[in-house]
């Protein structure tokens, strides 16, 4: 029986050139005449385009939305009602090439074409994109707050902020023809819900958003985002209503960077460089591709590339990568944004060099990669460490702590977070090392203590970066580095001349010289302990509430011992940035720790003293009685104390604590505790130290009071953040 | 219910050697430190040595007065501690006690202990 | 090495009395100090760790407070089952060294 065939409507968005018109300023206005007539003559001309070629049949409606410099281009949409079956024969490059066959026959052509009447279409200056009809939808609720902007080469041209009537606004960006359009996003508020889509094209259609953000995010303050031509429009969508722009967006055109690169490595190892995506930290922009040849000195050698934030993982070949496609000799790889860092390690097999290349595969886009490369010894990858083949990166081995995701570090270990003897395989403890006793058979632990030896888990690296096998010998008054680097900046851990956490007890003046009070509005909210001149350090989660994320709220105070009154060794301080680190991660309390730079450097004095911090290899033995003081509550879900309490904690082994907290304990977590409970930090005591006495009386940072179940709840221990995990990136911050 | 109980004691010449052991119940053996005390006829209690569990390294430590003689060492898979003890002089004559550390509840706490075995060293 | 010093030695008293012992420590050892109970014969008991806190099962007549190198352990109420020698033991570091022993005897 007849059957009606099935007609589906086909969305095309695209622009075209005019070559005998101008533009001007009145066509950006559209309650403007000139934009009226402009549009009502642009549109009558758009239609008898279409309806000239064999796509008039389908001809539904259309629309030319704004207008823009180039003599004069036109912005248009246009739907077509095609047979289902037809669909995909209809693709926006067939279009195109239908509507420009049809311009050129006409070129020439002394015959009278309505569509030519007034405008002189440029054949080669027509652009049609595919879109659908929710964008057109966006588009039009974006029209009563459209703006067209034209930044002409070597301009910044700071955008005028959102209409606050409208709900959502649209900033259609154009700039010189060959230029790419750089973009930059500053939230200025520390929270709003504001939202902001960028598009690689005049208008929004969702299969060219660049990228989208949200909120005023404190992750990225800063935003810049490249497109992949001269043309991008940016939608915002309101939030919460809000007297001030919380936003500020600016555009220049930046000139097409090269992404492609020849290099010889020299021979030897570590980091060599640096590769990145054309103006790094920018995002990426659609259509970016680069090539890097890298050439290696010798077949002992692979080549590592070391990722910050960002990890290579395999793919299934008929699904693209959504964060950038890399090639590494013929094996093809996606990007994916992670909050740890990363290697990958390329075997070398031939001298003929290694070609990495790295694609945009779709238009959306996200934070510029930058990776830094380097050889590796293929035989030896991790001198005195354990290769993680989860993650490319070398961690300690048999060190106690499951660097790696898989654990294999802490398996096949004769002696684990102890010192094996080489007469007979003994372990023994860290702390007997080098200590003037011989502990083994044969005094094995007091060998080559004069002398640097191979680095390993252990070792302590000195600034010339040889490793003596003394354990901990920062500070202990002896040189042990021949370059005396171990008992440099040890103006740290001294307690002053001096005199309620769960189940401890008052602190006296000057007891613990580095302890900070972080306060809002008078309040105490969080710990904090001083370890340099203008530097406090405290857990990220304390500024996990976005209201808590403005530097201005915060006040410091050092010398503190009652939090309802002063006394004259007190000292505050104003917050003059805040750093939180890069791969904290709120939901699992990973990497919780954040620093404060103060506003002045302090003065040192008997109340005012820093806190010392150890180095990567620093070990806390499990055992080792620790300590940590604050203002928190003296019992679960109590008011916080008025005086700085004090506690002696155990430091717990990281199996012991992982099985009770169901492995939920990272690598930057360290616990500390009693079987039975009683002694804990709690509420109020976050971000605060938990310290440990070295032999030589001063205190080293062990941890920062991180989380917990409860506060000294019995087979509960409290988990802190381990220093000697993001010692790297507070010497990175603070130096 | 928490049991120790020391075996091996007995006389023996100076100069030479004895092995205790100390065999733990009603607990797992292998999460725990454990310890020998001794106490010399009218006198006081005094610390020998302690091995700490496997979480914990496995290492030991002793008392100045026994070191290079006495080694302290542990089975978990059969759930008993020893006391190797070498060149034995008088002064270690006592009653030895094996003892239980929860290092869980504090570093160097013994909550267990066993009742003791005598040790005698005479010619 | 920290040396612990236990006075009295010895003490007669009656049952329902309350004694008190006291313990002194040559250095500053925090509250890391335990109070143990032991009759002839059989194996020391654990009664007080950190210096105050009351070990599980432990009745509540026997307590002990004090701290850096100060310390006291006293039994409120005495019962028959009391009369023992009382041992103080510091865990500050090692080795481990004990008070000579206070014995507690019926007057």
């Known amino acids: 029986g007849y059957k009606a065939e099935v007609m589906v409507s086909q969305v095309y968005s695209g622009s075209l050139r005019v070559l005998n018109r101008h533009f001007s300023q009145d066509l950006t206005r559209r309650e403007s005449s000139a934009f009226r007539s402009e549009t009502a003559k642009a549109q009558k001309m758009l239609k008898e385009l279409i309806t000239s070629t064999r796509l008039g049949t389908y001809y539904n409606s259309s629309s030319v939305y704004s207008f823009g410099e180039g003599p004069l281009t036109c912005f248009f949409w246009f739907i077509l009602q095609i047979p289902e079956h037809r669909r995909l024969m209809l693709s926006p490059e067939v279009v195109q090439a239908l509507l420009v066959e049809e311009l050129l026959s006409t070129v020439n052509s002394s015959a009278a074409v309505p569509y030519r009447a007034e405008y002189e279409v440029d054949p080669e200056g027509l652009v049609i994109l595919e879109a659908s009809v929710k964008d057109i939808a966006a588009l039009n609720s974006t029209l009563g707050c459209y703006r067209y902007s034209y930044v002409g080469q070597g301009q910044v041209l700071r955008l005028k902020g959102p209409d606050h009537l409208a709900s959502s606004c649209l900033w259609h960006l154009q700039g010189p023809k060959d230029l790419m359009l750089k973009l930059r996003l500053e939230w200025t508020l520390a929270e709003c819900r504001d939202r902001l889509a960028m598009y690689d094209v005049a208008g929004p259609l969702e299969k060219r958003l660049i990228t989208s953000v949200y909120g005023c995010s404190r992750q990225e303050p800063v935003v810049e985002v490249l497109a992949s031509g001269a043309i991008m429009a940016v939608v915002w969508k309101k939030g919460l209503h809000s007297y001030y722009d919380p936003f500020v967006l600016s555009v220049q055109p930046v000139v097409f960077q090269a992404c492609e690169v020849n290099l010889t490595l020299d021979n030897r190892l570590d980091s060599q460089g640096v590769l990145s995506t054309p103006y790094f930290p920018s995002y990426y922009s659609p259509q970016t591709h680069c090539s890097w040849h890298l050439t290696v000195p010798s077949l002992d050698y692979g080549l590592a590339l070391w990722f910050d934030a960002y990890a290579l993982r395999r793919q299934k070949y008929d699904l693209p990568c959504t964060q950038g496609q890399w090639t590494i000799q013929n094996r093809r790889l996606c990007g994916l944004r992670i909050l740890q860092p990363y290697a990958e390690r390329i075997p070398v097999v031939a001298t003929a060099g290694i070609t990495i290349n790295f694609t945009s595969q779709i238009s959306l886009t996200g934070p510029g990669v930058r990776v830094h490369y380097g050889l590796y010894n293929q035989s030896d990858p991790c001198p005195g460490e354990f290769l993680c083949s989860v993650n490319g990166l070398c961690v300690p081995a048999c060190d106690g702590v499951k660097d790696c995701p898989n654990g294999l570090d802490e398996r096949n270990c004769v002696c684990r977070a102890t010192f094996q003897c080489k007469e007979d395989s003994t372990c023994i403890s860290l702390p007997k090392v080098c200590d003037g006793q011989p502990d083994c058979l044969n005094g094995s632990d007091e060998e080559q203590c004069q002398e640097g030896v191979p680095c390993g888990t252990f070792t302590f690296q000195c600034e010339d970066r040889s490793c003596v096998k003394k354990p901990n010998p920062q500070c202990d008054g002896r040189p042990d580095c021949r370059d005396g680097s171990d008992e440099e900046h040890c103006d740290c851990g001294l307690q002053g001349p001096s005199s309620r956490i769960v189940g401890g007890a008052v602190s006296s003046e000057g007891e613990w010289p580095w302890q900070a009070s972080l306060q809002v509005r008078g309040r105490h909210i969080c710990g904090g302990a001083l370890i340099a001149d203008r530097w406090v350090i405290t857990a990220a989660h304390c500024f996990q509430e976005d209201s808590m994320a403005s530097t201005v709220l915060w006040t410091v105070f050092l010398g503190k011992v009652w939090q309802n009154s002063r006394w004259p060794g007190e000292v505050s301080f104003k917050v003059s940035r805040l750093l939180l680190h890069p791969y904290h991660e709120e939901d699992s309390h990973d990497y919780d720790v954040a620093l404060l730079q103060l506003d002045h450097p302090v003065v040192r004095s008997a109340a005012v003293r820093p806190v010392c911090l150890p180095a990567r290899s620093h070990f806390f033995e499990p055992g080792l009685h620790c300590w940590i003081t604050g203002w928190g509550a003296l019992r679960e879900g109590g008011p916080i104390s008025n005086a700085l309490q004090k506690v002696d904690v155990q430091l717990i082994p990281q199996d012991l604590c992982s099985e009770v907290y169901r492995y939920q304990v990272t690598p930057r977590m360290l616990c500390a505790g009693y079987r039975k409970g009683k002694k804990d930090a709690c509420q109020g005591d976050s971000g605060g130290p938990l310290v440990c006495k070295a032999l030589s009386g001063r205190w080293f940072l062990a941890g920062l009071v991180s989380w917990g179940l409860g506060c000294g709840r019995p087979n509960y221990f409290g988990v802190y953040t381990r220093i000697t995990g993001v010692i790297s990136w507070i010497q990175q911050v603070v130096t | 219910e928490v049991q120790l109980v020391e075996s091996g004691g007995g006389l023996v010449k100076p100069g030479r050697s004895l092995r205790l052991s100390c065999t733990g119940s009603?607990?797992?053996?292998?999460?725990?430190?454990m310890s020998w005390f001794r106490q010399a006829p009218g006198k006081g209690l005094e610390w020998v040595c302690f091995i700490r569990s496997k979480p914990y390294g496995g290492t030991t430590d002793y008392a100045p007065s026994v070191k290079g003689r006495f080694t302290i060492s542990r089975d978990d898979s059969i759930s008993i501690a020893y006391l190797q003890m070498n060149s034995l002089t008088t002064e270690d004559t006592a009653v030895y006690y094996c003892?239980?550390?929860?290092?869980?509840?504090?570093?160097?706490?013994?909550?267990?202990w066993g009742q003791g075995t005598q040790v005698t060293v005479s010619s | 090495d920290i040396q612990m010093t236990q006075s009295p030695s010895s003490l007669s008293a009656s049952l329902g009395d309350s004694i008190t012992i006291t313990c002194q420590a040559s250095q500053d050892i925090t509250n890391y100090l335990i109070w143990y109970q032991h009759k002839p014969g059989k194996a020391p008991k654990l009664l007080i760790f950190?210096?105050?806190n009351l070990e599980t099962g432990v009745p509540s007549r026997f307590s002990g407070s004090g701290s850096g190198t100060d310390f006291t352990f006293t039994i409120s109420s005495l019962q028959p089952e009391d009369y023992a020698t009382y041992y103080c033991q510091q865990y500050y570091n090692l080795p481990l060294t004990f008070g000579g022993g206070t014995k507690v005897d019926i007057k």
């Open positions: 009603g607990f797992t053996f292998g999460d725990f430190g």
């Open positions: 950190d210096a105050s």
């Open positions: 003892s239980r550390n929860d290092i869980l509840t504090g570093y160097y706490i013994f909550d267990y």
